[in-house]
């Protein structure tokens, strides 16, 4: 008789999840010499231990502490790029500008990027059928708690000038409910961070508006000000040209506004 299984509103665990995490870990540690000491089997065991046999609505940051410890990584604190609702461009940027890092350029971010996972209370099974949706089911699910934990730590580590890429095509350019708006912005440390510089990425080719004057950007400036951190904002009118100029900064067309 098949066991009754909780039906959640979100998609189930990504297929071949254990193999994917292990393979990504091996690949990452091969490419990044500073992480060669990491034992990927231990990393997977710690990852698995955070959610297996636990109710997928009762996950805590403490559950992920063993994984956080194994994945401890030092990135240059003044080279951090945060992003909100514009992941692809942010990743394209750090692929070119190799000395800057998004969360997904770190080991833990790389392991979990675009994956879903959850377990079941009191069984060692991974649930491939469904996992809790943040809105419809519960916020303390394995995926949300993971990203909240790593995002908080990433923001806490930042220093000097921190950059954030924001999507100017969205109705809320800065969204208080995004991971950036609800976690990262509140965990930048004023003793270390001098300025948050927002890059607002324009979508339309004919869009010449100053999106730095958008009301939601004023909300972001407000939160940052309350944290005793300076705020600045730049419009990126032509993201294609922006990336091109990062690749070839000496190009003559790269002196004008992007």
């Amino acid at each position: 008789v098949p066991r009754w299984r909780q039906q959640w509103s979100g998609p189930g665990t990504t297929k071949r999840f254990p193999e994917t995490v292990l393979a990504r870990c091996v690949k990452y540690t091969e490419i990044h010499p500073e992480m060669r000491h990491v034992d990927c089997q231990s990393v997977w065991d710690a990852f698995k231990g955070a959610f297996i046999s636990k109710h997928p609505c009762n996950i805590t940051e403490e559950d992920y502490q063993p994984l956080m410890k194994l994945g401890t990584q030092t990135v240059p604190c003044n080279k951090i790029l945060l992003w909100s609702r514009i992941k692809d461009l942010a990743h394209q940027f750090t692929q070119v500008q190799r000395d800057m890092f998004t969360l997904e350029d770190t080991l833990l971010g790389y392991l979990a990027d675009d994956l879903t996972w959850c377990g079941e209370f009191n069984t060692s099974k991974i649930n491939y059928q469904s996992c809790p949706d943040w809105r419809k089911d519960c916020s303390n699910n394995p995926v949300s708690v993971f990203w909240k934990t790593v995002s908080r730590r990433f923001a806490e580590a930042a220093c000097d000038v921190v950059h954030v890429m924001l999507n100017g095509s969205r109705s809320k350019i800065f969204d208080k409910n995004s991971t950036f708006g609800s976690v990262e912005v509140h965990n930048l440390q004023p003793e270390k961070v001098q300025t948050l510089e927002a890059w607002v990425i324009h979508g339309g080719r004919e869009d010449s508006r100053d999106l730095c004057q958008d009301p939601t950007i004023k909300e972001l400036e407000s939160i940052i000000s309350k944290r005793n951190i300076q705020f600045s904002c730049k419009n990126i009118y032509r993201p294609d040209k922006f990336l091109q100029c990062v690749k070839n900064p000496e190009d003559s067309s790269c002196t004008s506004e992007i």
């Epitope: 509140h186 001098q194 909300e219 400036e221 407000s222 939160i223 309350k226 300076q230």
Partner: antibody, heavy 123, light 107 residues
């Protein structure tokens, strides 16, 4: 305990300059931003802007750009408001107030205020 | 700039009565509204901060509610020490703006 102590009342003539001080104690001065608020007689409170106590960088509300200047003396845990070329309409009480943020709960509040400094501009 | 409209401008209440003050904002400010009490000759005192949070040491008879653009500040059982001006301040976006105040007197 946390205190913001402001300098005493000022009587000035139009065209003169005034510099008000706000000395903080009871907390780490450079951890929290300092706001300045104007209250003219019988009028609303008006937020003038804030001062980054780490960098000394000021941010002014549109109405207070030009003749107004915020500055800092970190070693003395003191913030300053200077008003140049005083006008009659600058007659008001000026308050300093810090922005507090809770590190554990994302809470923010303009919680502690100075006692206010009365500036009277009259010929 | 967010405009904050506060009413009533003045209020005369008997001791023991319930006091209600309202602020409307011209833009959606989530729950980033703060409420201050200012007695004559004193600086404003923060009673309630963002998220309708009662500040430490403030009596529980003070409370607030609201989200978006409509906010209400109430306190039960008015006392003589409550005679003061009351202000709402939005801290959602720069520049921070303040309501016109409510002067509370004893009837």
């Amino acid at each position: 305990q946390i205190q913001l102590v402001q300098s005493g009342p000022e009587l000035k003539k139009p065209g003169e300059t005034v510099k008000i001080s706000c000395k903080a104690s009871g907390y780490t001065f450079t951890n929290y931003g300092m706001n300045w608020v104007k209250q003219a007689p019988g009028e609303d409170l008006k937020w003038m802007g804030w001062l980054n106590t780490n960098t000394g960088e000021p941010t002014y509300a549109e109405e207070f750009k030009g003749r107004f200047a915020f500055s800092l003396e970190t070693s003395a845990s003191t913030a300053y408001l200077q008003i140049n070329n005083l006008r009659n309409e600058d007659t008001a009480t000026y308050f300093c107030a810090r922005w507090y943020y809770g590190s554990s709960d994302n809470s923010y509040a303009m919680d502690y205020w100075g006692q206010g400094t009365s500036v009277t501009v009259s010929s | 700039e967010t405009i904050v409209t506060q009413f009533p401008a003045s209020l005369s209440m008997a001791i023991g009565e319930k006091v209600t003050i309202r602020c409307i904002t011209s833009t959606d400010i989530d729950d980033d509204m703060n409420w201050y009490q200012q007695r004559p000759g004193e600086p404003p005192k923060l009673l309630i901060s963002e998220g309708n949070t009662l500040r430490p040491g403030v009596p529980s008879r003070f409370s607030s509610s609201g989200y978006g653009t409509d906010f209400v500040f109430t306190f039960e059982n008015m006392l003589s020490e409550d005679v003061a001006d009351y202000y709402c301040l939005q801290s959602d976006s720069l520049p921070y703006t303040v309501g016109g105040g409510t002067r509370l007197e004893i009837k």
